[in-house]
Interface confidence: medium
């Protein structure tokens, strides 16, 4: 079998064998090597010479196989925009940011650029769980049967109603979507407002 060409090699159809790690250089009609993540093009290829790559300097990065002549500058997560760092910048990866707790991404351009405070969910509701935290504003859904939530909050979850019998108590008032069950000692008299009803 014929040996595989090593970059730089001529390409008449403007395509290269390995699209990820090679690129077509139209000036010379050749395929040249891309530089691996964490590096940049230090010297461009020619008919004789393949691309020469060099490591990105501190505080800069290139994430992909590339033919960039510079590395991208690492940028911090901007707290003014509601962002916080979850992983530092490396030569191969930009700083990883996310919205601060209690915030959601309000502006997205390939990555989140601006976070805003999550809306409160009123009593009797909770924020619908999302696949990814901070991806969107709260969508409030009613507490399911047997659960309650009694605050206006962006993050409070509906809790199950207390089962009085589990505590050796009896139910004094049933729970609602906005309040927990009221329990009482079985030997205690009923509250005054309920006593008339009981006598009847």
């Amino acid at each position: 079998s014929q040996p595989q060409a090593v970059p730089p090699y001529a390409s008449e159809n403007q395509t290269c064998r390995d699209q990820e790690k090679e690129y077509y250089e139209p000036q010379h009609r050749i395929c040249c090597s891309r530089c691996p993540p964490g590096t940049y093009v230090s010297a461009k290829c020619s008919r004789i010479r393949d691309t020469v790559c060099a490591t990105c300097a501190e505080n800069s990065y290139n994430e992909h196989w590339n033919y960039l002549t510079i590395c991208q500058l690492c940028r911090p997560c901007d707290p003014v925009m509601g962002l916080e760092e979850i992983a530092p910048c490396t030569s191969k990866r930009k700083t990883q940011c996310r919205c601060q707790p209690g915030m959601f991404c309000a502006a997205w351009a390939l990555e989140c650029t601006h976070c805003e405070l999550l809306s409160d969910c009123p009593p009797g509701t909770e924020a619908e769980l999302k696949d990814e935290v901070g991806k969107g504003n709260n969508h409030c859904v009613p507490c399911k049967a047997g659960h309650f939530q009694n605050t206006s909050s962006p993050s409070a979850r509906c809790q199950p109603h207390t089962r009085c019998e589990n505590q050796g108590l009896v139910e004094a008032a049933p729970g609602t979507a906005q309040s927990d069950t009221t329990c009482k000692n079985p030997l205690e008299p009923l509250p005054p407002e309920m006593s008339g009803t009981m006598l009847m």
């Epitope: 000036q27 010379h28 230090s42 010297a43 461009k44 290829c45 020619s46 008919r47 004789i48 010479r49 020469v52 060099a54 002549t69």
Partner: antibody, heavy 120, light 110 residues
Framework: QVQLQESGPGLVKPSQTLSLTCTVS??????????WSWIRQHPGKGLEWIGF???????YYNPSLQSRVTISVDTSKNQFSLKLNSVTAADTAVYYC????????????WGQGTMVTVSS | QSALTQPASVSGSPGQSITISCTGT?????????VSWYQQHPGKAPKFMIY???VRPSGVSNRFSGSKSGNTAYLTISGLQAEDEADYYC??????????FGGGTKLTVL
């Protein structure tokens, strides 16, 4: 601006090794993009490309000379060097060092050249 | 590989135009737009004049121009001046991953 200056013995005995150095001034040999080259010119004749080097040590040689030639670089001295072994009278020539345009293989800046005679 | 073929000499009077040819083969001049030209005055180093057949580096007079047809590249000098008197060399990439120069042309300004 960048200037190049060749230096080395003007007379070398047959079968010995020809050694020349090119000193780069007015700029860094480690500048991104620039390869550096040796070219020679036989008396009264045309030019012959010998090879390229990058400051990282990457080299490319003329296939007809590859078995005898070594080009090296010393970034601390801003110099690159040529060694040509097993020389004969046919290696008598003016030897030039030159800078290579990024992404091209054309020689934009040349040294003034140094004459090397191979004779016993 | 053999050198590219250039005429040994050409001449012209001041103000005239002259053209120097550089003939190669299908595997060098004919295949690639990678021809460069160099001017060399006696006892001096070559000077870079043209690359990629037609591209003139900054600082080189626009009286110098390059072209190519088939396997032959051309250097044209218009409005010939006394200081243009020199040797001119073409250079081309060849398939064997090397570079080859022409034998040189002596230009005489009459």
């Amino acid at each position: 601006q960048v200037q190049l200056q060749e230096s080395g013995p003007g007379l070398v005995k047959p079968s010995q090794t020809l050694s020349l150095t090119c000193t780069v001034s007015g700029g860094s040999i480690s500048s991104d993009g620039y390869f550096w080259s040796w070219i020679r010119q036989h008396p009264g004749k045309g030019l012959e490309w010998i090879g390229f080097i990058y400051f990282t040590g990457i080299t490319y040689y003329n296939p007809s000379l590859q078995s005898r030639v070594t080009i090296s670089v010393d970034t601390s001295k801003n110099q690159f060097s040529l060694k040509l072994n097993s020389v004969t009278a046919a290696d008598t020539a003016v030897y030039y060092c030159a800078r290579v345009i990024p992404g091209e293989d054309a020689f934009d800046i040349w040294g003034q050249g140094t004459m090397v005679t191979v004779s016993s | 590989q053999s050198a590219l073929t250039q005429p040994a000499s050409v001449s012209g009077s001041p103000g005239q135009s002259i053209t120097i040819s550089c003939t190669g083969t299908n595997s060098d001049v004919g295949s690639y737009n990678l021809v460069s030209w160099y001017q060399q005055h006696p006892g001096k180093a070559p000077k870079f004049m043209i690359y990629e057949v037609t591209v003139r580096p900054s600082g080189v007079s626009n009286r110098f121009s390059g072209s190519k047809s088939g396997n032959t590249a051309y250097l044209t000098i218009s409005g010939l001046q006394a200081e243009d008197e020199a040797d001119y060399y073409c250079c081309s990439y060849v398939d064997s991953k090397t570079w080859v120069f022409g034998g040189g042309t002596k230009l005489t300004v009459l």
